[in-house]
């Protein structure tokens, strides 16, 4: 019989009685092998992906995911209905908008179906895991001879987002950054007409509606300056 023993400290003789549990296929193993951590992100409050690193399992394992909301009307345990796969092995679960309740404690449980006692539960505050879509429709307006105003739109409740504007000229080696609150506009008071400027923006679900740490992707950049039309200085140029 070529079966195996697995122990978490290498000393199988002194610890076997404490760690061993009977497993399928006539093998013995520990029940303490940790499951991978689940990472969830709520994309623009349209859907949520909860993912894990399936490669960390010592054998190919289709881990299963269940979820519920703690102390709420939605506390019934739900099975994942839409698994994400990485090379034929489950590596995540996608939840749709109707299943997302931002301000209730989300409980997610990962389980090994080969060894049902091997499970891990995490509690998450979804309002801190929202990632908005990148800002769109960037526009530039010349307020005066030397002042530019940048505006943009977000596909979300504007008051929930803060923004980070970056700009630089073609003479600069690095970006200049400016934080912007929920108002989604930015003014650059002193513009050099001889230089070409590039602007881009990203947004974050913080601080009014949540405390998310992750920013959106950067917007497509918008350019203004020396090679913009000379005939009409109030025109803006948008380049992806």
């Amino acid at each position: 019989l070529n079966t195996t023993i697995l122990t978490p400290n290498g000393n199988e003789d002194t610890t076997a009685d404490f760690f061993l549990t009977t497993m399928p296929t006539d093998s013995l193993s520990v029940s303490t092998l940790p499951l991978p951590e689940v990472q969830c992100f709520v994309f623009n409050v349209e859907y949520m992906n909860c993912t894990w690193n399936s490669s960390s399992e010592p054998q190919p394992t289709n881990l299963t995911l269940h979820y519920w909301y703690k102390n709420s009307d939605n506390d019934k345990v739900q099975k994942c209905s839409h698994y994400l796969f990485s090379e034929e092995i489950t590596s995540g679960c996608q939840l749709q908008k109707k299943e997302i309740h931002l301000y209730q404690t989300f409980v997610v449980q990962l389980q090994d179906p080969r060894e049902p006692r091997r499970q891990a539960t995490q509690m998450l505050k979804l309002q801190n895991l929202v990632i908005p879509w990148a800002p769109e429709n960037l526009t530039l307006h010349k307020l005066s001879e030397s002042q530019l105003e940048l505006n943009w739109n977000n596909r979300f409740l504007n008051h929930c987002l803060e923004h980070l504007v970056q700009y630089r000229t073609d003479w600069d080696h690095s970006w200049t950054e400016q934080s912007v609150d929920y108002r989604h506009k930015f003014s650059l008071p002193s513009v050099d007409g001889q230089k070409r400027y590039t602007f881009r923006v990203r947004s974050r679900f913080n601080p009014l509606c949540g405390s998310a740490q992750h920013w959106s992707e950067w917007s497509h950049p918008i350019h203004w300056g020396s090679n913009t039309s000379k005939e009409n200085p109030f025109l803006f140029a948008l380049e992806a």
Epitope: L6, P8, G10, S29, P58, P60
Partner: antibody
């Protein structure tokens, strides 16, 4: 590029301990997605898996029951290597011993060069 | 434990031949079957992982197929450097990792 370099004596006396080391370059012994194996090849048993170690927030060890009670695999994070100790050897343990990494899709994607071990007094 | 059975245990073939080696698992292993080539005095070398995926750097004349319990390794046009011993290995249910007994491919 991952490389595994084996070292250790090729001659062991019966009843003594066989000790081999596998030095890793291009990966970490404490990677949270790899596992590190010892395998041997003999004419009588073909390729035979002996055991493995892997790190998932703590160290884990799997051993084949064909050598259980005689085998220990030890990772050494400071030297980025892992070792095989097989005690109470008999002529049945004479074989070519290999270390190997479990990598992509749970295949053994990198192997050491092999060490021919003879058991003789 | 899952037992792996290869056939044939040895075969003779000529350069340019198409060669097929089969491997059968004692229970379903999905597509978690790997193929290795071993030459005398050398370590085994991974050829095919996950039944049909070609390992980087391996010539395209090698291919793998199968799922469940029955798998094949095919060499479409045998080259002189292909004469070696070939092993299958399951990674579906470990431990233990189990190998086939090997197929020795010789020059006719």
């Amino acid at each position: 590029q991952v490389q595994l370099q084996q070292s250790g004596p090729g001659l062991v006396k019966p009843s003594q301990t066989l000790s081999l080391t596998c030095a890793i370059s291009g990966d970490s012994v404490s990677s949270n997605i790899a596992a590190w194996n010892w395998i041997r090849l003999s004419p009588s048993r073909g390729l035979e898996w002996l055991g493995r170690t892997f790190f998932r927030s703590t160290w884990f060890y799997d051993y084949s029951l064909s050598v259980k009670g005689r085998i220990t695999i030890n990772p050494d994070t400071s030297k980025n290597q892992f070792s095989l100790h097989l005690n109470s050897v008999t002529p049945e343990d004479a074989a070519v011993y290999y270390c190997a990494r479990t990598g992509r899709r749970w295949s053994l994607d990198y192997w050491g060069q092999g060490t021919l071990v003879t058991v003789s007094s | 434990d899952i037992q792996m059975t290869q056939s044939p245990s040895s075969l003779s073939a000529s350069v340019g031949d198409r060669v097929t080696i089969t491997c059968r698992a004692s229970q379903s292993i999905s597509s978690y079957l790997n193929w290795y080539q071993q030459k005398p005095g050398k370590a085994p070398k991974l050829l095919i992982y996950a039944a049909s995926s070609l390992q980087s750097g391996v010539p395209s004349r090698f291919s793998g197929s199968g799922s469940g319990t029955d798998f094949t390794l095919t060499i479409s046009s045998l080259q002189p450097e292909d004469f070696a011993t070939y092993y299958c290995q399951q990674s579906y249910s470990t431990p233990p990792i189990t190998f086939g007994q090997g197929t020795r491919l010789e020059i006719k």
